[in-house]
């Protein structure tokens, strides 16, 4: 009945509703049917959120912060539904809401505790800073403060730097990890305990490849089954690092099954893509193709980074010409 938020029953006519920032929610309240229905929703026992009586809304005294954001299920009132439809919740809306329902038979009050969470999709980035390599797990907007854990080769790491900036309604968090010289795999997990939502970033470095000029190279990129769910929307991006910045070679969007290729020598095997294998080929290698190649598979719940180092060496003919 209440599809836009999940709520937990707790004692004493009190329920907890968990909403997401900027989404719509329903604060539930029901009563025994009766004539002359009066409904008053209040926030923190002080601010008028919504009033209904004598068959219509009376919003003259409504607190301005709720203007055009609340409504009742008018066709359901006679069936005992006093629930409040609440549009675009913000973190300032968190708190206790009291629903007063009176009829000619009885008066009841229900309390609803609204908690609001934020979890904008995090990202895992691979960065070069001078001679150092960093993995950075970051989330632009999150509330409440998340739990961030790092693992190296599936073993938890205690070292966990967190750069945190707080705004009025959420936190922005960066968690960098220096992985210079490491061949290990790394995993970063960001958990929002309120929204019961977890995101995982996984980074794997493949063995370096040595290729001759004019040859082609095949670089593997297959998602780990633990995270990957093919019926969930995701994006695959192949990019190459040049002078500290990545340039995109190609990307694939699962929602539209679209492939966009920016490098004419790049090829993707459509049949492999259909089997969730995003390995790529780069033809006709030249010396400037040496570098790091990054495959990024990302969805709302994970980012899987696979990095390949390619060394392109001059072919014998090129060497003899010199």
């Amino acid at each position: 009945i209440f599809p836009l938020a999940f709520f937990i029953y707790v004692p004493m006519n009190e329920q907890i509703v968990i909403g997401r920032l900027d989404e719509d929610i329903i604060l539930p309240s029901s009563f025994e049917r009766g004539s002359e229905v009066v409904i008053h929703w209040k926030y923190q026992d002080s601010y008028k959120v919504h009033s209904y009586y004598k068959g219509s809304d009376h919003l003259e005294s409504q607190d301005p912060r709720y203007a055009n954001r609340t409504s009742l299920f008018y066709n359901e009132i006679q069936n005992g539904n006093a629930s409040l439809f609440f549009r675009r919740v913000s973190l300032l809306d968190e708190g206790i809401y009291t629903c007063y329902v009176g009829t000619a038979i009885q008066v009841i009050t229900n309390k609803v505790v609204l908690k609001v969470g934020v979890f904008l999709t995090p990202v895992m980035k691979y960065e070069k800073r001078n001679t150092n390599s960093f993995l950075i797990c970051s989330v632009l907007s999150v509330y409440p403060r998340p739990i961030i854990t790092w693992k190296m080769d599936n073993t938890p790491i205690s070292e966990n730097n967190m750069e945190e900036t707080g705004s009025l309604d959420s936190f922005s968090i960066n968690s960098p990890l220096n992985i210079t010289g490491s061949n290990s795999s790394y995993e970063c997990t960001i958990e929002n305990s309120l929204l019961k939502q977890t995101w995982t970033g996984r980074w794997t470095m493949k063995d370096g490849l040595h290729k001759m000029q004019s040859e082609h190279v095949s670089l593997s990129c297959q998602p780990v089954n633990d995270y990957f769910s093919p019926n969930q929307d995701f994006k695959v991006t192949w990019s190459r690092m040049k002078s500290g910045t990545f340039s995109v070679l190609a990307y694939y969007l699962s929602s539209s099954q679209n492939t966009i290729i920016n490098e004419s020598r790049f090829s993707w095997n459509k049949e492999l893509i259909n089997q969730s294998d995003f390995s790529m080929n780069l033809m006709d290698l030249n010396l400037s193709d040496s570098g790091e190649y990054l495959c990024n598979i990302s969805s709302d719940e994970y980012t899987l980074l696979t990095i390949h180092t390619v060394h392109v060496e001059p072919s014998q003919e090129t060497a003899s010409h010199n």
Epitope: S35, E36, V38, H40, K42, D45, K48, Y53, K54, S61, Y100, G102, T103, A104, V107, T109
Partner: antibody
Framework: QVQLVESGGGVVQPGRSLRLSCAAS????????MHWVRQVPGKGLEWVAV????????DYADSVKGRFTISRDNSKNTLYLQMNSLRVEDTAVYYC?????????????WGQGTLVTVSS | DIQMTQSPSSLSASVGDRVTITCRAS??????LAWYQQKPGKVPKLLIY???TLQSGVPSRFSGSGSGTDFTLTISSLQPEDVATYYC?????????FGPGTKVDIK
Amino acid sequence: QVQLVESGGGVVQPGRSLRLSCAASGFTFSNYGMHWVRQVPGKGLEWVAVIWYDASEKDYADSVKGRFTISRDNSKNTLYLQMNSLRVEDTAVYYCAKDLISGIYYVDHWGQGTLVTVSS
Amino acid sequence: DIQMTQSPSSLSASVGDRVTITCRASQGISNYLAWYQQKPGKVPKLLIYAASTLQSGVPSRFSGSGSGTDFTLTISSLQPEDVATYYCQKYNSAPFTFGPGTKVDIK
């Protein structure tokens, strides 16, 4: 059963003040609106004031606006009427009355009343 | 503010008679009208609300009708215990004004 007992009435001079109280029992006081209604002996009923269940709204008859203040203490189950600048024409029996619901309906229970006499 | 008038201001009727009292509002008040009975020396008692709904415990000889501006209270068969003053009250919005009352007695 609902019981409303008014007190605080008496004889007072014009221009003076008086505070009426109404002790409520037999129902959840904090859930209901409350009214004061007055009646000059031998005359008709005159609605004086209403206060919502949570005291968030109050309304007054034009004849008492600015002079009378209705209030309530839900923790004490008590309704009040503070009457200032009393006039001879305020002489009446003052009834405390319970609203059907929150303070926007009719009176469904009445107290016995307390007599206020304004006289020099 | 909306004014309430009642007619007649008083009436005498015989036991068993049908008695009708009229209440008029100066502006429409939908069906937000209540009727009260006040017997001599007693406090008022609610008879009818929402213009036509009988309060529980009130004898069925009392009935109410009307909507908008014109309302009536009818006693289908007057009884000695019905001697009282009857008041209408509007409650669509404050001020919740009473009518001036109609005094009913037995001939």
